[in-house]
């Protein structure tokens, strides 16, 4: 009860609870690489607890230490179709603002067709995140398939 | 103040630290591509704290965003046995109660013998996850090698 | 009683959110097949809040379930190469105290240059980690494609 | 230690071949490439190719068009190297040589060198 | 290919003296946070001998009056004091792709 009450008087987002999960839009048009991701209920199963989407791209809201998740699958694939397209590579970086502009991780699909991997990365407010996907290789737009999400970890 | 002082009359399940790594146990009859999972301390390093295991099958107890990880290492696999019986395929889902029932994480084997993801998803009490496990290979039952997880992340 | 009331003067540690995320120094000399790692702020964006390294292992400081996380990309590979090479396996595991000494994740290389991977697992203070490489291929140094991290999850 | 032993010294006319032999001890033969560099008299070195004797497979260098066959036999832990229309400036040693411990194209262990000749 | 240019061709070094070998790649043999630039020593008659390895590591049983720097493209070989058992050919070598190429050599003697 009384820790029920205690949340009253605080939002959950100013407990440092930031979280997200995206889900796949769409591909940028040529030459650009990043993909475009959606969230929200209306969606399905994704979702924005703090940070927002700024033209699909993610921007975090609250400074910390976040644990940043992707999983990308490339649509109609086989391994020969991925070894025969290498290198099909995605990076997930801080993209703006530029000052701070960096790959924080980075993943090649040789004679795979699914991606997935996480870190730990300290983000600041107004970091907004890019997910670059090079390769003539499109991704799966299956909300199971193709996800991104932070979580907000500590200050 | 009042939101730490709240923590001292409740024990950490209420505090929403629901918490689970399992480790598999065996897979399922033919026709049940379901695996099966066990988790306690006298296994190993596997524990359940607050979610419970229903058949084999991890249900949840606490209503909120999780984290769901999961490795499959295939048994007695090379690149060439794993493109041999392609597809295998590694679906997590919600499987019960029917009406919530969806595929939250699904990877393919390809040309590798293990898989290994995580994503966040938002899961409500009652819930139960299943994980299938599509082909003709065996999963490792060690320890090291296949493995389940959840994490109660914010409600 | 006191734990929580204490919470209200103590630093961001007490709270037990220890945290890490490390990159990648050296490999070992011939015949030691642990990667030595390294953090904190003035290498870039690997940090240490809580464990310590000692000679490039990490030790953790509190006692609880972890979340282990690592990825591990191959320097100048192809997935000609990592097949080639095949055994190359990464282990991480505890390797001090002596009698903790276990395998908590391992995934093999097989046709991919890249693995990652994520558990949850209970540590204790004085728990040493190590990341075991065999093969005869070198990882990549490049702090977005290796990275090594643990997280306190609960008590 | 590893050591790499090589056949000894051989006289070609021009457009003959030759084949040389490199003997590995230690087991480890069929996890390293086995590479081949030659020297000219007086001159510096030149990769030629590798061959990795765990599968077979063969990088060469292209300025050798297509002369150049190397081979592996696993079961005496034996690399040879074949050089095919032989001309005078293919008088060179010619040495095996491999890495002790991560298999990139640096070379910790030589062979003793094989001297091939091409007179007429 | 990667072309490897040493300087200079030749050098004579008093004995205790520092030796000094540049070598410049014809583009950058570094990746994957690593430099791929190799020295060798040839004596008269014998195999060439790896003294250091990535740039900067020193082989095993190499005297430690050897050391190599650099990353990119221009990379050097230093020898501290200058001994007599020194006087050799030098090679720079490239492994960042195939194939792997050598410096033209650098033969090194005493002033």
């Known amino acids: 009860q009384r820790f029920a009450q205690a949340q009253q008087q605080l939002p959950l987002e100013s407990l440092g609870w930031d979280v997200a999960e995206l889900q796949l839009n769409h591909t940028g048009p040529q030459q650009d690489p990043r993909l475009y991701w959606q969230g929200g209920p209306a969606l399905g199963r994704s979702f924005l607890h703090g940070p927002e989407l700024d033209k699909g791209q993610l921007r975090i809201h609250r400074d910390g230490i976040y644990m940043v998740h992707i999983q990308v699958t490339l649509a109609i694939c086989s391994s020969t179709t991925a070894s025969r397209h290498h290198p099909t590579t995605l990076a997930v970086g801080i993209c703006s603002p530029a000052s701070r502009s960096i790959s924080l991780l980075r993943l090649s699909f040789h004679q795979g067709c699914t991606i997935a991997s996480q870190r730990l990365t300290p983000l600041a407010r107004g970091d907004t995140l890019c997910t670059n996907l090079t390769g003539t290789l499109l991704p799966s737009r299956n909300t199971d398939e193709t996800f991104f999400g932070v979580q907000w970890v500590r200050p | 103040q009042r939101f730490a002082q709240a923590q001292q009359q409740l024990p950490l399940e209420s505090l929403g630290w629901d918490v689970a790594e399992l480790q598999l146990n065996h897979t399922g009859p033919q026709q049940d591509p379901r695996l099966y999972w066990q988790g306690g301390p006298a296994l190993g390093r596997s524990f359940l704290h607050g979610p419970e295991l229903d058949k084999g099958q991890l249900r949840i107890h606490r209503d909120g965003i999780y984290m769901v990880h999961i490795q499959v290492t295939l048994a007695i696999c090379s690149s060439t046995t794993a493109s041999r019986h392609h597809p295998t395929t590694l679906a997590v889902g919600i499987c019960s109660p029917a009406s919530r029932s969806i595929s939250l994480l699904r990877l393919s084997f390809h040309q590798g013998c293990t898989i290994a993801s995580q994503r966040l998803t938002p899961l409500a009490r009652g819930d139960t996850l299943c994980t299938n496990l599509t082909g003709t290979l065996l999963p490792s039952r060690n320890t090291d090698e296949t493995f389940f997880g959840v994490q109660w992340v914010r409600p | 009683q006191r734990f929580a009331q204490a919470q209200q003067q103590l630093p961001l540690e007490s709270l037990g959110w220890d945290v890490a995320e490390l990159q990648l120094n050296h490999t070992g000399p011939q015949q030691d097949p642990r990667l030595y790692w390294q953090g904190g702020p003035a290498l870039g964006r690997s940090f240490l809040h809580g464990p310590e390294l000692d000679k490039g292992q990490l030790r953790i400081h509190r006692d609880g379930i972890y979340m282990v996380h690592i990825q591990v990309t191959l320097a100048i590979c192809s997935s000609t190469t990592a097949s080639r090479h095949h055994p190359t396996t990464l282990a991480v595991g505890i390797c001090s105290p002596a009698s903790r000494s276990i395998s908590l994740l391992r995934l093999s290389f097989h046709q991919g240059c890249t693995i990652a991977s994520q558990r949850l697992t209970p540590l204790a203070r004085g728990d040493t980690l190590c990341t075991n490489l065999t093969g005869t291929l070198l990882p990549s140094r490049n702090t977005d494609e290796t990275f090594f991290g643990v997280q306190w999850v609960r008590p | 230690e590893v050591q790499l032993v090589q056949s000894g010294a051989e006289v070609k006319k021009p457009g003959s071949s030759v084949k040389v032999s490199c003997k590995a001890s230690?087991?480890?033969?069929?996890?390293?490439?086995m590479h081949w560099v030659r020297q000219a008299p007086g001159q510096g070195l030149e990769w030629m190719g590798a061959?990795?004797?765990?599968?077979?497979?063969?990088s060469y260098n292209q300025n050798f068009k297509g002369r150049v066959t190397l081979t592996a036999d696993k079961s005496t832990s034996t690399a040879y190297m074949e050089l095919s229309s032989l001309r005078s400036e293919d008088t060179a040693v010619y040495y095996c040589?491999?890495?002790?411990?991560?298999?990139?194209?640096?070379?910790?262990?030589w062979g003793q060198g094989t001297l091939v000749t091409v007179s007429s | 290919d990667i072309v490897m240019t040493q300087s200079p061709d030749s050098l004579a070094v008093s004995l205790g003296e520092r030796a000094t070998i540049n070598c410049r790649a014809s583009?950058?043999?570094?990746?994957?946070?690593?430099?791929?630039m190799h020295w060798y020593q040839q004596k008269p008659g014998q195999p060439p001998k790896l003294l250091i390895y990535?740039?900067?590591n020193l082989e095993s049983g190499v005297p430690d009056r050897f050391s190599g720097s650099g990353s990119g493209t221009d990379f050097t070989l230093t020898i501290s004091s200058l001994q007599a058992e020194d006087v050799a050919v030098y090679y720079c070598?490239?492994?960042?792709?195939?194939?792997?190429?050598f410096g033209q050599g650098t033969k090194l003697e005493i002033k």
């Open positions: 040589a491999r890495n002790s411990y991560y298999d990139y194209a640096w070379f910790t262990y």
């Open positions: 230690g087991d480890t033969f069929p996890r390293y490439n």
């Open positions: 061959i990795f004797p765990g599968t077979g497979e063969t």
């Open positions: 583009k950058s043999v570094s990746s994957s946070g690593y430099s791929f």
């Open positions: 990535l740039a900067d």
């Open positions: 070598q490239h492994s960042r792709e195939f194939p792997p190429t």
